[in-house]
């Protein structure tokens, strides 16, 4: 059974992941640039189910495409450094889901835009944090 300290650590990591995802979404929403239209043409795979920490495998598998899309947004008004950001998220995801997890991600049939993708994982984090609070 998880101890209160392990629960606290999990909650803190989920809060970090949530804030990082919110920061990305905020950066995109603030982005007034023709590149935004192009960013929205990229498609992301969505998890068929995302209710447990092991389902973060689905997010991990989409981090490389996410970094590639964010690289498009580089400008003086986009303050997220994609490589640092994705590296940070990857570390958190690995710690949360466990590096020894052998979960095979199942994806939904429909793909999503970067905004829909981020909103989905933000909701996932918020949902799990709510159960821990």
């Amino acid at each position: 059974a998880p101890t209160s300290s392990s629960t606290k650590k999990t909650q803190l990591q989920l809060e970090h992941l949530l804030l990082d995802l919110q920061m990305i979404l905020n950066g995109i929403n603030n982005y007034k640039n023709p590149k935004l239209t192009r960013m929205l043409t990229f498609k992301f795979y969505m998890p068929k189910k995302a209710t447990e920490l092991k389902h973060l495998q689905c997010l991990e598998e989409e981090l490389k495409p996410l970094e590639e899309v964010l690289n498009l947004a580089q400008s003086k008004n986009f303050h997220l450094r994609p490589r640092d950001l994705i590296s940070n998220i990857n570390v958190i995801v690995l710690e949360l889901k466990g590096s020894e997890t052998t979960f095979m991600c199942e994806y939904a049939d429909e793909t999503a835009t970067i905004v829909e993708f981020l909103n989905r994982w933000i909701t996932f984090c918020q949902s799990i944090i709510s159960t821990l609070t």
Epitope: S87, I122, T133
Partner: antibody
């Protein structure tokens, strides 16, 4: 104990820049992202942005985009907020807050010619 | 951006009164709502987080409720030190936004 200590009051002329510091102590600096909130005299609270203290990346409210820069120095557990092209309506108390339950004492920035 | 609307903007009450402040979000924010108390010249103080969880050290006369778009802060028996301005805040999505504040004054 956990605390955030901010730099002292500043008086600036329109068009100038101001840099406010916020020094954290009593907790692991990289564990909590730092937000900046401001409050104009007699007005409500306004979120300016957030910085990830571990990696240093930031996200700002659209209103401040292009004028605000948030940075951090992990060696001194200090976060900085710099606001440029100051105008009279930037006169406010600026607060840093870590995890929303710990706040700095506030820094009054007065912009006047 | 999510708009947060508080009511009333001010109220007068006496010590011992039950006081209720409401906050409405322009879209659903689940329970990602906090309440703060602020006294003149001081930083805001967190009272309630996650809509209904009392922050440590906050007296039990303060309570929060609600989810979705409608939220309430209740002070069951107003004390002299409770006269202040109260703000609600959503952290469901960026930008974080606050209500305009409710000033609780002595009747």
């Amino acid at each position: 104990q956990v605390q955030l200590v901010q730099s002292g009051a500043e008086v600036k002329k329109p068009g100038a820049s101001v840099k406010v510091s916020c020094k954290a102590s009593g907790y692991t600096f990289t564990d909590y992202y730092m937000h900046w909130v401001r409050q104009a005299p007699g007005q409500g609270l306004e979120w300016m942005g957030i910085i990830n203290p571990r990696a240093g990346y930031t996200s700002y409210a659209l209103k401040f985009q292009g004028r605000v820069t948030m940075t951090r120095d992990t060696s001194t557990s200090t976060v900085y907020m710099e606001l440029s092209s100051l105008r009279s309506e930037d006169t406010a108390v600026y607060y840093c807050t870590s995890g929303w339950d710990v706040w700095g004492q506030g820094t009054l920035v007065t912009v006047s010619s | 951006d999510i708009q947060m609307t508080q009511s009333p903007s001010s109220l007068s009450a006496s010590v011992g009164d039950r006081v209720t402040i409401t906050c409405r979000a322009s879209q659903s924010i689940s329970t990602w709502l906090a309440w703060y108390q602020q006294k003149p010249g001081k930083a805001p103080k967190l009272l309630i987080y996650a809509a209904s969880s009392l922050d440590s050290g906050v007296p039990s006369r303060f309570s929060g409720s609600g989810s979705g778009t409608d939220f309430t802060l209740t002070i069951s028996s107003l004390q002299p030190e409770d006269f202040a301005t109260y703000y609600c805040q959503q952290s469901y999505s960026f930008p974080v936004t606050f209500g305009q504040g409710t000033k609780v004054e002595i009747k």
